[in-house]
Amino acid sequence: QTDMSRKAFVFPKESDTSYVSLKAPLTKPLKAFTVCLHFYTELSSTRGYSIFSYATKRQDNEILIFWSKDIGYSFTVGGSEILFEVPEVTVAPVHICTSWESASGIVEFWVDGKPRVRKSLKKGYTVGAEASIILGQEQDSFGGNFEGSQSLVGDIGNVNMWDFVLSPDEINTIYLGGPFSPNVLNWRALKYEVQGEVFTKPQLWP
């Protein structure tokens, strides 16, 4: 376990071999989750890229947060996708939080502390627990089958995950840098493995 506070993973160039694998202590399927993270890239007006890829052996797109060029954020649960459009692209560090719950199918997507309109996805579904969680690449099969054209070039950090839906107040607290206790992925006690050319550097966002 490593305390990654104030640090970020840096992916300096496009590749299909560089990634970070995150280890999560999940023992049972997820009926809800929240993922929050920071990232910083210049790619957004150039091509799509993977932000957070959670694959199981049953479904390689179990949870996927992806930037789709000319559209915005693509959010997939259990292979089914919804979009959160972004009309104008700026180059700046971005903080995102996204949550989903099985009971209602409701998805929330927050960008820099501001909520997008709620949408619905995969009501009644459960997310598999035996997962390969990858930063920097999009998994087309469990733990692999990467494409360089979908890789992240830039920084990513503050990756935290909960097995429940955070309240708006809690998400606001996280965005403002307040205290929180994630129970699936914890950036301050992170189990991870680096493959390829990935560096750990001080974070560039506040």
Epitope: G48, G79, S80
Partner: nanobody, 117 residues
Amino acid sequence: EVQLQQSGPEVLKPGTSVRMSCKASGYTFTDYNIHWVKQSRGESLEWIGFVNPDTGDTYYYKNFKGKATLTFNRSSSTAYMDLRSLTSEDSAVYYCARGTTVEKDYWGQGTILTVSS
């Protein structure tokens, strides 16, 4: 076995409309989005949009807003695309595909549309 079976070729006059279909089988229809893609002769693929048969959400890429309308019928596991005010520019092969904007794993065989006076 997953299959996407598309409707047959169409020859139509400018100014008319067309509906093409894409019948899914071999999986639960509501589990995956259905995308529509245009391939004009000698051109690269153009993404038209997609429909989520679970939620009913549709998304249209910029060039096809107002040109295409995407619908579906859950009971028959069929997705439809209507194209209106046809011109010769709409002559192309149109494909449906299962998946996401990131990856599409199964494709229909294509529907050839010819618009000619």
